[in-house]
């Protein structure tokens, strides 16, 4: 559910569901700030541009972060 990014946290609920890295358009890791005291991970999916809040503590999501960072390091010269 959308809430103003500058005012507060964004995620009302979180998902533990595994996400296929290939289906990701973008992965945002938003660190704690004065606006939101929690880390929030927001995945933008290629299909319909759907955005999902992911559970930073979930094993599946931690694996996703590893896979994405590995993919990025491969691409960077």
């Amino acid at each position: 559910i959308p809430l103003s990014r500058t005012v507060r946290c964004t995620c009302i609920s979180i998902s533990n569901q595994p996400v296929n890295p290939r289906s990701l358009e973008k992965l945002e890791i938003i660190p704690p700030s004065q606006f939101c005291p929690h880390v929030e991970i927001i995945a933008t999916m290629k299909k319909k541009g759907e955005k999902r809040c992911l559970n930073p503590e979930s094993k599946a999501i931690k694996n996703l972060l590893k896979a994405v960072s590995k993919e990025r390091s491969k691409r960077s010269p």
Epitope: C11, I12, S13, S15, K51, C53, L54, N55
Partner: antibody, heavy 124, light 109 residues
């Protein structure tokens, strides 16, 4: 099975306080946003408050703002509603409800699981 | 704040008939943010439709939702005896605020 059970209702005098509880079971409570909704006798549904999975987001209906506080204890799988400065018009059945799939930003999945309700009567 | 109006207040129909319930918003509402609920006397509400047109788990296909902008509709194609109840529309608005309509009672003619 997925279940929500409210407790803490009763008869209370105007101006007094009451705390409602909602015990959740059968799902990962700490992943879900939660709501309180009330229904006055013979009337329709009125949304009261919402809290995000980690308590970072809270929202209230204008009618209860400044008097009611929603909170949760994820270690106990329990949702709370602290009601202060109670008025006769707060008399209602209070339901707790789970946000359907609030992880999907820009889409509202409704309240998909409801408790059976607990009755609050404010009367002198 | 967005206000939802439901009409008619009461709908008197016979089993087997089609029921059309209206929900009108005072300002435009994203169809992604509209839901419908059913409530029977002495029971908690039950989610029927979310996202204006998606049926919730276990809801029979005689229930359907449609609409956009300010006008939304819940249709029950053929009323079954268990469908006589009160129906509420609900919308999500930022802040976060969640608003219910006043309800439409569907009773037996």
């Amino acid at each position: 099975q997925v279940q929500l059970v409210e407790s803490g209702g009763g008869v209370v005098q105007p101006g007094r306080s009451l705390r409602l509880s909602c015990a959740a079971s059968g799902f990962t409570f700490s992943d879900y946003g939660m709501h309180w909704v009330r229904q006055a006798p013979g009337k329709g549904l009125e949304w009261v408050a919402v809290i995000s999975h980690n308590g970072a987001i809270k929202g209230y209906a204008d009618s209860v703002k400044g008097r009611f506080t929603i909170s949760r204890d994820n270690s106990k799988n329990t949702l709370y509603l602290q009601m202060n400065s109670l008025r006769a018009e707060d008399t209602a059945v209070y339901y707790c409800a789970r946000e359907g799939d609030g992880s999907n930003i820009y889409y509202y999945y409704g309240m998909d699981v409801w408790g059976q309700g607990t009755t609050v009567t404010v009367s002198s | 704040e967005i206000v939802l109006t439901q009409s008619p207040g009461t709908l008197s129909l016979s089993p087997g008939e089609r029921a059309t319930l209206s929900c009108r918003a005072s300002q435009s509402v994203s169809s992604s943010y509209l839901a419908w609920y059913q409530q029977k006397p002495g029971q908690a509400p039950r989610l029927l439709i979310y996202g204006a047109s998606s049926r919730a788990t276990g809801i029979p296909d005689r229930f359907s939702g449609s609409g956009s902008g300010t006008d939304f509709t819940l249709t029950i194609s053929r009323l079954e005896p268990e469908d006589f109840a009160v129906y509420y529309c609900q919308q999500y608005g930022s802040s976060p605020i969640f608003t219910f309509g006043p309800g439409t009672k569907v009773d037996i003619k």
